[in-house]
Interface confidence: low
């Protein structure tokens, strides 16, 4: 999906109002310096691409993020503010429902959510121009 035509300010508002807090709740009990940020992004569409991938694509050691509160709110924000996004997700969502597993918060998931926090931060802070 090409995130170029999303309403970035509305997505930013959704992040500020709820998603950020859900991410913090998920990470509660974890030190902010425990994980190094290894994933970054260069502009808002790129950040959303990385956020979408880390939030909804199962990875080795962490297959359960898509049912978390922050993930559902992320999905809702993208569906509302990114034209055509929801249509691209119908098949993926149906497949996900079939393989829903017991929720387990692994260290790998915590690391992945830490990366997500970094990506959202970068999304909210387009880099200052170098002068």
């Amino acid at each position: 999906y090409d995130f170029t035509n999303c309403d970035f300010e509305k997505i930013k508002a959704a992040y500020l109002s709820t998603i950020s807090k859900d991410l913090i709740t998920y990470m509660s009990g974890t030190k902010s310096t425990e994980f190094n940020n290894t994933v970054s992004c260069s502009n808002r569409p790129h950040c959303l691409t990385e956020i979408q991938s880390l939030t909804f694509n199962p990875t080795a050691g962490c297959a359960s993020l898509a049912k978390e509160m922050f993930a559902m709110k992320t999905k809702a924000a993208l569906a509302i503010w990114c034209p055509g996004y929801s249509e691209t997700q119908i098949n993926a969502t149906q497949a996900m429902k079939k393989r829903r597993k017991r929720k387990v918060t692994t260290n790998k998931c915590l690391e992945q959510v830490s990366q997500l926090q970094g990506l959202w931060r970068r999304f909210n802070r387009p880099l200052l121009k170098q002068q």
Epitope: S17, N37, R121, R125, L128, Q130
Partner: antibody, heavy 121, light 105 residues
Framework: EVQLVQSGAEVKKPGASVKVSCKAS????????MNWVKQAPGQRLEWIGI????????SYNQKFKGRATLTVDKSASTAYMELSSLRSEDTAVYYC??????????????WGQGTTVTVSS | EIVLTQSPATLSLSPGERATLSCRAS?????MHWYQQKPGQAPRPWIY???NLASGVPARFSGSGSGTSYTLTISRLEPEDFAVYYC????????FGGGTKVEIK
Amino acid sequence: EVQLVQSGAEVKKPGASVKVSCKASGYTFTDDYMNWVKQAPGQRLEWIGIISPYNGGTSYNQKFKGRATLTVDKSASTAYMELSSLRSEDTAVYYCAREDYDYDGYAMDHWGQGTTVTVSS
Amino acid sequence: EIVLTQSPATLSLSPGERATLSCRASSSVSYMHWYQQKPGQAPRPWIYATSNLASGVPARFSGSGSGTSYTLTISRLEPEDFAVYYCQQWSSNRTFGGGTKVEIK
């Protein structure tokens, strides 16, 4: 624990330059912006500018543009503020302040202890 | 540049009284932050994003407002509350208000 430790007090002559440092610890230095704020004796807080340690990008208060230069040394997790062509009205306490974007509105959530700069002939 | 005007400049009250501090912006801003500063100390974040109390701030403090008008309220002043309070916006660069000094009457 997040800590910002600033360099010591400076006494400078008019026309000279001063470079204040701010050593950050307890968080990933490149994740957050660093602000610099001036407070003249008995006066309000005055924003000087902001720098992104991630890429060195800067934005300045027009009042300080051209005289203030913000830089970082990523390897040392240290931010710097250099002020040139000093005059008596630059006598003030200068603070570095981390800007955290986990809070709505990106607040300055941790401050250095302040560096007193005195400009006197 | 967005100019923030705080009023009153000085508020003389007794412990136990209610304090209402105002911050007006020259144009609309999304949120307002408040900082507390005591003599010889660096400012401390006090209220984030209009109404969220910073860690360790007592519940007698509250913040409200929107657009160009924001308020910090202390429901019942305690001795440790006497200080200078600054508002700050970030919608357009960053600017601070002139501060309100809350002093003991």
